[in-house]
Structures are given as C-alpha cells and as structure tokens.
Interface confidence: medium
C-alpha cells in the first residue's frame, strides 16, 4: 500500500469543522483506517470512494480538542500485509476569543447537560464566533461537567449552576442580542463559600501549568470582572 495524499495539519478555532483527506493506492486496493491520539476515531464521519485502484478517505471532525490524526492504509498480498501511515496534527488557536466576542443571537436552550439547571424555555446567548454555537457550547459544558464528578456534594450543584449560566448566558434580545453575565456576588459565593477548596486546587493547577490548554478557563468565570447586582438590576443574572 502506498499513500498518494497525506492528511494536512490544521490550526483552527474551537468549534470548527475540519475535513482530513487521505488517498492511497495498491494491489489489491487498500483499506484506510483513522487513528486519533493512538486510538480508533471515536467521533466524526468518514466517507470513502474508490476509483481506478485509488481509495480516497475523508474524515470530517468537529474540533473540541487538539489531536494527532493518523491515516493507515493496509492491503494484503497472500499472507503478507503492507501498511503505509501518514499523520496530521490539529491544534487549536485562540481558545478564549469566543468569550470576548459579543456576536451572537438569542435562542431557547435545547441541550441536555444544563436541562436541570437552566430555567425551562430559558433564552440563552449562542456565540456565532463558533462554527456551530449550540454544539460547541454544549461540548464545553460537557467537558467541564465531567471534571465536576470529583468535587464535594456541597460544591457540585453550585458549580454546575455557575458553569451552565456562564457558558449558556441568559440573553437579552432586541436590536443587539446581548449575553447577560452572572452577577459578581453569585460567582463569589460559589468561589469562596461552596467551592473554596476546589477553586484553590484548580487555580493552583493553572499556575503550575498542569492544564494543557486554556479550554477550562472558558468554563470558569473571573468573578472580579463580572458586574455587580447593585449597578444595574438587569445587567447581570442571579443564580
């Protein structure tokens, strides 16, 4: 088996769609498999076409984390296997940009992770700096939610409420749809009262560089930068 076209590396923003191409040839026509960080690809769609002993495989991915993607072309002559490999890296640029961008729209929350936390028919802000805002924001919550499984029973419900209301911010509709941040007082209550130990551990890990990316920072608000409920009763959301 021989690879004619290797997949290309990409540097993309969180929530982007990327298609990796791998083309191979051989007699007989090889099969192509994709590996993600050493394991079989768990998500994404694969499309294949074969023409004139050439196989073309396209892997479409929704990017939520960096990764090494390997295309493996294999065919068999009698008892002998022939294998060719080619790899591409997907890295993520500007993790925190979407949070600074106020471009988006209001829509009812249709996800699952925050169903029990957000009000029924809650109007949330969906950020159009993501390719697919609903999917990207739901994945952000899902990723951070998994980390909450290890926190204390006192901290967990408060952290879940903070997380969901921070990533799926309440939305003020109108001419310029605007996300309504959590009130500073509620954020501080979670940080200093309900989750004081956990928050310290997380900040310590951040300073020591134990987090490989800034992704978790998207799901943890900086309390000091949030508006106070005493400034404008409608400018921030109460948990």
């Amino acid at each position: 088996a021989r690879i004619l076209r290797a997949p290309e590396s990409h540097n993309v923003t969180f929530g982007s769609f990327v298609t990796l191409h791998c083309t191979a040839t051989g007699i007989p026509v090889p099969t192509i498999t994709w590996i993600e960080n050493g394991n079989a690809v768990s998500s994404g769609s694969i499309q294949e076409s074969v023409k004139d002993r050439v196989i073309d495989s396209r892997l479409q991915l929704f990017i939520t984390k960096p990764g090494l993607y390997t295309c493996i072309a294999t065919n068999k002559h009698g008892e002998k296997f022939s294998t060719a490999k080619a790899a591409a890296t997907i890295s993520i640029a500007e993790w925190s940009k979407p949070q600074k961008d106020n471009k988006g729209y209001c829509a009812q929350y249709r996800g699952e992770v925050c169903n029990a936390v957000l009000a029924k028919d809650a109007l949330v802000f969906l950020n159009t700096s993501y390719a697919d805002p609903e999917e990207a924001q739901e994945l952000l919550v899902h990723t951070a939610w998994n980390e909450l499984k290890v926190v204390s029973p006192v901290c967990r419900p408060a952290a879940e409420a903070l997380l969901c209301n921070h990533i799926f911010q309440e939305c003020s509709p109108g001419v310029v749809p605007t996300p309504i941040p959590i009130c500073r007082e509620y954020c501080l209550a979670v940080k200093e009262l309900f989750c004081a130990k956990e928050w310290l551990v997380m900040e310590e890990k951040t300073h020591r560089g134990l987090y490989r990316s800034e992704m978790h920072l998207l799901s943890v608000p900086e309390c000091s930068k949030l508006p106070s409920m005493h400034w404008d009763p409608t400018a921030c959301a109460r948990l």
Partner: antibody
C-alpha cells in the same frame, strides 16, 4: 431632567435629503448605557422605528430604511442627527427623537421623547 | 419582522370603567419583551409598560400589562379623564423594533 428637542426644515423637496437634529439638554449623550433614536409617525398612522446610535457611536437601523439613513452624533454640541436621502411623499411624517432606556431590558424602549417635528415632502 | 396588530381600533368607554386593550404579535415575542405607550393628540408618546408587565417610573398602578408569546393585554382598571388617548404597543424583542397600529380610547 433630560429633555430632547428636534429641529430642521419642515418642508423638503422630493429626491432631496431630509436632515434633522436632536439637541439633548440636562444630560450628556456620551454618558454610558443610553441609545439615541429616531422614530417617525405618518399622519393618522402608527409609529415606525428608524434607527439609533449608541453612546459608543455604533449605529443600528431599520432594514427597510437602512440604505437611505444615516444617524450621527456631535458630542461637543450634545446633539445627534438624522439624514434620510432620496425622500418621497411617503416620508412625510412627524419625526421624533427619543432616548432608549439605560438598563439592559430597557435599551430598546423609549423613556424620553422630543415633542416631534412635522416634515412634509413636497415640490 | 414581527407585525403587531392592535384591537379594537377604537374603544368607547366612560370614566371609571375598565379598559382592556389587545396586542397580537405575528410571531412569539421573546421573554415578553413588549412595551406600551400612551399618546395624546399633538404630543409625543409616553412609556407606560415594558417587558409586558413592568410599569415605567411614575406610572399609576391602574395601568397593568400582561401576556406572553403572541398575545398581550394592557388593562386600565378605572379610567380617569386624563387616560383618554391613543395607546401603542411595541415589541423590543428583535430587530427591527416594531409598533402596533394603535388603539384609541375615547369618551362614550
């Protein structure tokens, strides 16, 4: 107490540009949070939102008028202005300037209005 | 755009009576972002209600707003002589901001 006063010609010829100014007294147009709007009312009819300018200088217009409308501000004179180009008889109306409320839920409702100025488009 | 239809066009009532004005939207108004204004002849509109049910500063409590989705109501519990005027609804839920055609409340 904030007050708004419209000024400008009461008669404009068809195809010309209608120009109106709103002078704000009792408060600064550049003070945070407010948006400054133009709304019109055709004789005996309902109200129509034309557009507004935010304290930050960003402008937002009604899509039906967007190609003909410009709203600008002169902070030194504490005024904001409306220009409506290529006018026709259908633009004959009372033109109001108004202030959008400061709070987030109030920015697209109008809590203070000028008394209005009648503009007739006729040759 | 959201089209607002007000009914009735004219309401003839006597002072002391209850007035019920309707405003129907062509599509759902998010978060009940609907406002009501009062307008007297030769004057500019005056904000009464925003967010469907919140009274603006200085508005007497005989004025109340209710409703959600596509159907909204302005109620004046006991009409005072100064309440005879035109009333406009406005949605502040999506762009462009739109107003209803108005309801005139006149003395019977």
């Amino acid at each position: 107490q904030v007050q708004l006063q419209e000024s400008g010609p009461g008669l404009v010829k068809p195809s010309q540009t209608l120009s109106l100014t709103c002078t704000v007294s009792g408060g600064s147009i550049s003070s945070g949070g407010y948006c400054w709007s133009w709304i019109r009312q055709h004789p005996g009819k309902g109200l129509e939102w034309i557009g507004y300018i935010y304290y930050s200088g960003s402008t937002y217009y009604n899509p039906s008028l967007k190609s003909r409308v410009t709203i600008s501000e002169d902070t030194s004179k504490n005024q904001f202005s409306l220009k409506l180009s290529s006018v026709t008889a259908a633009d004959t109306a009372v033109y109001y300037c108004a202030r959008g409320g400061r709070w987030l839920q109030l920015r697209d409702v109008f809590d203070i209005w000028g008394q209005g100025t009648m503009v007739t488009v006729s040759s | 755009e959201i089209v607002l239809t007000q009914s009735p066009g004219t309401l003839s009532l006597s002072p002391g009576e209850r007035a019920t004005l309707s405003c129907r939207a062509s599509q759902s108004v998010s978060s009940s972002y609907l406002a009501w204004y009062q307008q007297k002849p030769g004057q500019a509109p005056r904000l009464l209600i925003y967010g469907a049910s919140s009274r603006a500063t200085g508005i007497p409590d005989r004025f109340s707003g209710s409703g959600s989705g596509t159907d909204f109501t302005l109620t004046i519990s006991r009409l005072e002589p100064e309440d005879f005027a035109a009333y406009h609804c406005q949605q502040h839920s999506s762009s462009p901001l739109t107003f209803g055609g108005g309801t005139k409340v006149e003395i019977k």
